[in-house]
């Protein structure tokens, strides 16, 4: 997950901003085909976040269609057999083997566009994709860790005097919490559910009587969020004295 | 909808009181703070203090400690704020505001003249 | 207190100009403010909640960004309904503190 952050920094800045694209594509635009396939020979391997909800499309490498015999996606989900999703040219036949997920298909016929789309992104789609394309020249390869994120639901109340707890619920992966200004906390708990998500959860406490308004900033890959609430008097003041 | 309804312009001599009243309809009086800010014609937004009506409890800006006093009344949904000992300088419309800030009352119109 | 520098105290603009105000709040203390317009003889109008979020009913060309001690305002194209002063607020810290106040004319 590390390195998927600091690898897409870019990617995941432009979700940011752009919280209305409905799908992501890493697929590299035609002209950019390479003619030379030496320099597609290496295994690419791309770690790539993914919102959950959205589509999503995984290419394969930008191999000329005449060169192919074989293209194969190779699917590895957790907890599940490899699925496998393959065409052949010369038959023009195309196979699955232990592929159940309808959401996973090919973008349109595989001699039109190899590429495979999630329409729309599940959190059972965390997994490795890889696209195989035989050629005479040797096999070249394109493989995603796809990790799903997942937003969290961010809440913020004041449970008792001056004690403020804020939650990042169901989110994945972990979301980061902060607060303004800081309080005096308790140490950061973490509730890891079955389908991957963790809630997170903050409960600070502030005496002094200055602080007027508490904020939680909620950080995370699918963006980051902020609420703010107004903390209640310390009990049994009345009336602030020279405070500042 | 929170909504804001405030007392009428007065005009009062230097060295008088004034009493502004603010009330408060749309959410539960008692769990929010109540604020006062205040504007002298042609400046800037300048807050007096705070006041939260379930408790009484009480912020005074440093400035106007002494001469200001806040109250409410809970039966009535209405907070309360005088200002003592009154001068020129006080010549302000006065605002009340809960929510942080998000409502605002129309503004009273105090006006201190000899 | 927390005192609030925003600047620039006035300034004329074309329509269709990008307007960016910025609000520091002293001390290098994290704060969270508000941005407010105000027109004469009118209450001030909450148009950026907690830094960043457009209030419900603001037009989009009304932004605001920062976190911590410096703040941005901006309008995007400005329109001539935007002549008003505009205002921060810190309300972390008691007492609150506003801003000296933008007053933005349109040329």
């Known amino acids: 997950e590390g390195a998927a952050q600091s690898n897409n920094s870019l990617m995941l800045q432009t979700s940011k901003e752009n919280h209305t694209l409905a799908s992501n594509s890493l697929c590299m635009d035609e002209k950019q085909i390479t003619q030379n396939h030496s320099k597609v020979l290496a295994e690419v391997n791309i770690s790539w976040p993914v919102q959950m909800a959205r589509n999503a499309v995984l290419c394969c490498p930008p191999i000329e269609f005449r060169n192919l015999i074989v293209i194969t996606w190779e699917i590895i989900l957790r907890g599940q057999p490899s699925c496998t999703k393959s065409y052949r040219k010369e038959t023009n036949e195309t196979k699955e083997t232990n592929c159940t997920d309808e959401r996973i298909t090919w973008v349109s016929t595989p001699d039109q566009n190899s590429d495979l789309q999630i329409h729309p992104v599940a959190i059972t789609h965390d997994g490795y994709y890889r696209c195989i394309m035989a050629t005479p020249d040797g096999n070249f390869h394109r493989g995603y860790h796809l990790q799903v994120l997942v937003t969290p639901e961010v809440t913020l109340f004041e449970s008792r005097n001056r004690t403020a707890v804020c939650k990042a619920v169901a989110g994945k992966p972990a979301a980061q919490i902060s607060w303004i200004p800081a309080g005096d906390c308790a140490p950061t708990e973490q509730e890891y559910w079955g389908n991957g998500t963790v809630t997170v959860k903050s409960t600070c406490h502030w005496e002094g009587h200055n602080v007027s308004t508490v904020t939680c900033h909620v950080s995370h890959l699918t963006g980051n969020k902020s609420l703010y609430i107004e903390l209640l008097p310390v009990p049994g003041a009345k009336k602030s004295a020279k405070l500042y | 909808e929170v909504q804001l309804v405030q007392s009428g312009a007065e005009v009062k001599k230097p060295g008088a009181s004034v009493k502004v009243s603010c009330k408060a309809s749309?959410?539960?009086?008692?769990?929010?703070?109540m604020h006062w800010v205040r504007q002298a014609p042609g400046q800037g937004l300048e807050w007096m203090g705070n006041?939260?009506?379930?408790?009484?409890?009480?912020n005074y800006d440093e400035k106007f400690q002494g001469r200001v006093t806040m109250t409410a009344d809970t039966s009535t949904s209405t907070v309360y704020m005088e200002l003592s000992s009154l001068r020129s300088e006080d010549t302000a419309v006065y605002y009340c505001?809960?929510?942080?800030?998000?409502?605002w009352g129309r503004g009273t119109l105090v006006t201190v003249s000899s | 207190d927390i005192q609030m520098t925003q600047s620039p105290s006035s300034l004329s603009v074309s329509v269709g100009d990008r307007v960016t105000i910025t609000c520091q709040a002293s001390?290098?203390?994290?704060?969270?403010l508000h941005w407010f317009q105000q027109k004469p003889g009118k209450a001030p109008k909450l148009l950026i909640s907690?830094?960043?979020n457009l209030e419900s009913g603001v037009p989009s060309r009304f932004s605001g960004s920062g976190s911590g001690t410096e703040f941005t305002f901006t309008i995007s194209s400005l329109q001539p309904e935007d002549a008003a002063t505009y205002y921060c607020?810190?309300?972390?810290?008691?007492?609150?503190?506003f801003g000296q106040g933008t007053k933005l004319e349109i040329k």
């Open positions: 505001l809960t929510g942080t800030g998000t409502s």
């Open positions: 749309g959410h539960t009086f008692t769990s929010y703070w």
């Open positions: 006041i939260y009506p379930g408790s009484g409890s009480i």
């Open positions: 001390q290098g203390t994290p704060i969270n």
């Open positions: 907690g830094a960043s």
């Open positions: 607020l810190q309300f972390t810290y008691i007492p609150w503190t």
